[in-house]
């Protein structure tokens, strides 16, 4: 008799793929054009990235550091009207893109949560949650929660409101903290909270340290669903050199949890390459006309248009990974097992029941390495075959689909491999 199939876990929409943050509408659309109506015109692009949710804003009225002039129920007219927002929601729904609204109150000011009047602000947030849930949003984000006194209890209350409306609604909290204990204490009292932090940004970009951070985090959080990013808002290029962007994309898309990206991560958008642009929200490079300030700073291969035409680009890799992440059971909700592969390397298996399995091997170092995959670290349910097919490499030159002998696996500097192999009884 065939073995019984493992029961599928309940999957929420945010379990099925990546979230895409657009914190600055104007920078995302190009200066002078940033509003909700314009964003609606970019939804096809988001669809092409196969992202499941758009984390938008903040877009509410906020006069810098002025509680009285901060209205979480009103859209700042610079971004558009409530009608524009409703229209965006409808269009996004048609394209199966969920909309998460950032309600970080004092986003233009010094302290995101104002330094005083915590209770007033918390009440405003509560009212806003109820208002925007009725308006049809799919979730909320609040950032910089380390600046919010009694954050855990407020988050628990906001989570109750959100989940009370529907189990299908999401609350995301963001913190600048990279300390595991602080992160765990925030998660403790909030079962379904998705938390973005700077935890992984401390990886020092080495295989061993990244492996240890990831495994510590997963062990500490148990079987709760988590998210993966390098910060609560910043671009990957704020933390990583260009040669590691592909590697991190592969890792973020294949770890168990929800990958969270900022606009521009898919093309390696780098504020440092665009003089005068703010590090936290540089202008999105749609094509070579996107940064007329200093045209020589932009070449075609830095833009969405240029990378869309290049199958070997970072954007093409992002699209492929996003596609795999949203359709393969082992990547959607499979078990995770990290194991030793030699110094400088981080490798792990993702597997679910009798579905196709995935092996990820990442070389964070700047020298080529032979992988010594230690299958003895793995449980019997996740054993390694002698060969696995190459699904993709982060570097050009490998023949995709070809079987690779796992005992003789060699990786180029900064190379990541995604290999697939079938379940064997």
């Amino acid at each position: 008799r065939a073995p019984r199939c493992r029961e599928l876990p309940a999957q929420k929409w945010w379990h099925t793929g990546a979230l895409y943050r657009i914190g600055d509408l104007q920078a995302f659309q190009g200066h002078g054009a940033g509003n909700l109506a314009g964003l609606k015109g970019r939804l096809d692009y988001l669809s092409s990235l196969k992202v499941k949710g758009l984390v938008l804003g903040p877009i509410h009225k906020n006069q810098k550091d002025d509680v009285a002039q901060t209205d979480l129920l009103q859209i700042d007219p610079n971004f558009g009207s409530k009608e524009d927002f409703d229209s965006l929601l409808q269009s996004a729904k048609k394209k199966s893109i969920r909309v998460i609204l950032d309600l970080t109150p004092n986003y233009r000011g010094e302290n995101s949560w104002f330094s005083t009047q915590v209770d007033t602000v918390a009440t405003k947030v509560k009212d806003a949650l109820e208002f925007w849930l009725q308006a049809g949003v799919d979730g909320f984000q609040v950032r910089d929660i380390e600046n919010l006194k009694d954050a855990s209890s407020f988050l628990a209350e906001w989570q109750n409101i959100t989940k009370g409306f529907s189990e299908d609604r999401l609350l995301i909290a963001g913190t600048n903290s990279s300390d595991l204990q602080q992160i765990l204490s925030l998660l403790e009292s909030n079962k379904d909270l998705l938390l973005t932090s700077s935890y992984l940004s401390d990886s020092g970009s080495t295989g061993e340290h990244t492996k240890s951070l990831v495994t510590q985090y997963l062990n500490a959080t148990g079987n709760r669903w988590c998210s993966w990013s390098l910060s609560q808002a910043r671009l990957l290029t704020s933390f990583l050199p260009a040669q590691l962007l592909r590697l991190y994309q592969l890792m973020l898309f294949t770890l168990p949890g929800t990958p969270v990206f900022s606009y521009g991560d898919e093309i390696g958008l780098d504020a440092a390459a665009l003089p005068g642009q703010p590090m936290e929200a540089p202008v999105m490079l749609w094509d070579e006309s996107s940064f007329p300030d200093i045209p020589g700073a932009v070449s075609a291969n830095m833009t969405v248009k240029g990378q869309s035409e290049d199958p070997g680009s970072l954007l093409s890799l992002f699209r492929r990974l996003s596609d795999q992440r949203s359709k393969e059971r082992s990547l959607l909700h499979g078990d995770f097992h990290a194991f030793s592969a030699g110094p400088g390397l981080f490798s792990y298996i993702r597997h679910w029941d009798q579905n196709e399995r995935f092996l990820v091997v990442l070389n964070f170092g700047d020298v080529g390495l032979s992988a010594g995959l230690q299958a003895s670290d793995l449980p019997a349910s996740a054993s390694l075959p002698a060969k696995a097919d190459l699904l993709l490499s982060t570097q050009p030159g490998r023949e995709e689909g070809s079987p690779l002998e796992l005992e003789r696996l060699k990786l180029e500097p900064h190379e990541g491999l995604l290999l697939r192999f079938p379940y064997a009884a």
Partner: antibody
Framework: QVQLKESGPGLVQPSQTLSLTCTVS????????VIWVRQPPGKGLEWMGI???????NYNSALKSRLSISRDTSKSQVYLKMNSLQTEDTATYYC????????????????WGQGVMVTVSS | DTVMTQTPSSQAVSAGEKVTMSCKSS????????????LAWYQQKPGQSPKLLIY???TRESGVPDRFIGSGSGTDFTLTISSVQAEDLAVYYC?????????FGAGTKLELK
């Protein structure tokens, strides 16, 4: 109206640090970038660096290791600090306003200070 | 970095004469997306700070007399003074802002014959 005015010591000892201030009026440093340019006696203009409206800085690569530009928006002042001065740093130092049209920062300079002459000598 | 080459380095002229000076860039300064040429001209009179004369290769800054005419293609630019006045004696610098860092030419000095 728009004005920029440089101030600082006219004489600096070799190996010492130069500190200059550019005080601006008629515009906000939160909206406009300010550049520093220097001109050795009888020579051409050399772009030194910029502090942008958002506070980011960029420097001439030849000077990067010893140059620092900062600002205090509340005082409408931009500061230049350059260490390890040598005699070849003798020049007139200018600050100027980087053009901004309300949307884009195009890199020409529409207002200049009158300059401050700095001599590096023992 | 983009190199800006100005010729001649100095030029002696008489009042009322037409004068042209050249500025060549090592790369094109024409941006095809907006058809603009990212080149500015400055005038620096003796003992004074530079003053913006022309931007976008041919647009005069307000208050600049119309005897100053900027022209040019993507890499070759010209500043023409249709009828030189005594107050025009100065050093003229071109500057590109297409690439970063911004770079200046070495200047053309206009002297009286």
């Amino acid at each position: 109206q728009v004005q920029l005015k440089e101030s600082g010591p006219g004489l600096v000892q070799p190996s010492q640090t130069l500190s200059l201030t550019c005080t601006v009026s008629g515009f906000s440093l939160s909206s406009y970038g300010v550049i520093w340019v220097r001109q050795p006696p009888g020579k051409g203009l050399e772009w030194m660096g910029i502090i942008w409206a958002n506070g980011n800085t960029n420097y001439n690569s030849a000077l990067k290791s010893r140059l620092s530009i900062s600002r205090d928006t509340s005082k409408s002042q931009v500061y230049l600090k350059m260490n390890s001065l040598q005699t070849e740093d003798t020049a007139t130092y200018y600050c100027a306003r980087h053009y901004y049209d309300g949307t884009h920062y195009y890199g020409y300079f529409d207002y200049w200070g009158q300059g401050v002459m700095v001599t590096v000598s023992s | 970095d983009t190199v800006m080459t100005q010729t001649p380095s100095s030029q002696a002229v008489s009042a009322g004469e037409k004068v042209t000076m050249s500025c060549k860039s090592s790369q094109s300064l024409l941006y095809s997306e907006n058809k603009k040429k990212y080149l500015a001209w400055y005038q620096q009179k003796p003992g004074q700070s530079p003053k913006l004369l022309i931007y976008w290769a041919s647009t005069r800054e307000s208050g600049v007399p119309d005897r100053f005419i900027g022209s040019g293609s993507g890499t070759d630019f010209t500043l023409t003074i249709s009828s030189v006045q005594a107050e025009d004696l100065a050093v003229y610098y071109c500057q590109q802002y297409y690439n970063f860092p911004y770079t200046f030419g070495a200047g053309t000095k206009l002297e009286l014959k």
